[in-house]
């Protein structure tokens, strides 16, 4: 018997210091480029090897970025979001939403959660 898949959503504040090659990640999303149906939010699509985000270790592919240095990322065009990151300065504070996949087995059994990609 297969269990249903649920998601555990958590939020975290991540402070990154811009490295020699920048912050070290890619994003998708925006009002003109929806990554998730009916959601114009900004999502992390790639963490670059040895970049600031990878070395910090907390930001994950698939995370939703809610704000940058306190500025909300809701209802932004994709390029406007990109520009916001590029102009965010040396110390960058990200409010992110992680979504962990939790496999619920048959009644009485709860499987372990895996980060969703």
């Amino acid at each position: 018997m297969n269990g249903r898949v649920d998601y555990l959503v958590t939020e975290e504040e991540i402070n990154l210091t811009r490295g020699p090659s920048g912050l070290g990640f890619n994003i998708v999303g925006g009002t003109d480029q929806q990554y998730v149906s009916n959601d114009s939010g900004i999502y992390v699509s790639r963490i670059k090897e040895n970049g600031a985000a990878a070395l910090d270790g907390r930001l994950q592919e698939g995370d939703k970025i809610l704000s940058v240095n306190g500025q909300d990322l809701k209802n932004l065009l994709h390029q406007d979001a990109v520009d916001l990151f590029r102009n965010a300065g040396y110390a960058v504070s990200l409010r992110v939403q992680h979504r962990l996949q939790v496999q619920n087995g048959p009644i009485g059994h709860r499987g372990e959660g895996d980060p969703s990609g």
């Epitope: 090659s21 920048g22 912050l23 070290g24 990640f25 890619n26 994003i27 998708v28 990554y35 992390v44 699509s45 790639r46 963490i47 670059k48 090897e49 592919e61 698939g62 994709h78 390029q79 990109v82 990151f85 590029r86 969703s116 990609g117």
Partner: nanobody
Amino acid sequence: DVQLVESGGGLVQAGGSLRLSCAASGRPFSSLDMGWFRQRPGKERDVVATINWTGDSTYYLDSVKGRFTISRDNAKNTVFLQMNSLKPEDTAVYYCAARGGGSSVDSEYDVGEFEYNYWGQGTQVTVS
């Protein structure tokens, strides 16, 4: 994680054609940059062709330009490598690779251009 499964390899005579396919699962395919790499006997793995997540930018190894074509079908979560006018030196294990696409938050130019972090198991292509 992203899972990649290649198919379409085999034995073909010089001058012949093969079409490799790579089916991806595990996350939205339309957000992935895709690539084909190959490892020839006794050599390192080389990039053959890449296609970005939007499908509007491709790259080809000089020696395959005009003979190989990379394409993607986002509805089928699949990337293809059409290989024509095959030569014995194309004999290799061909690997499908993926990475997250999207826009770099750092600059318009991507460092580590061929840095891919998800790999298939490979499919053998032998040209006799």
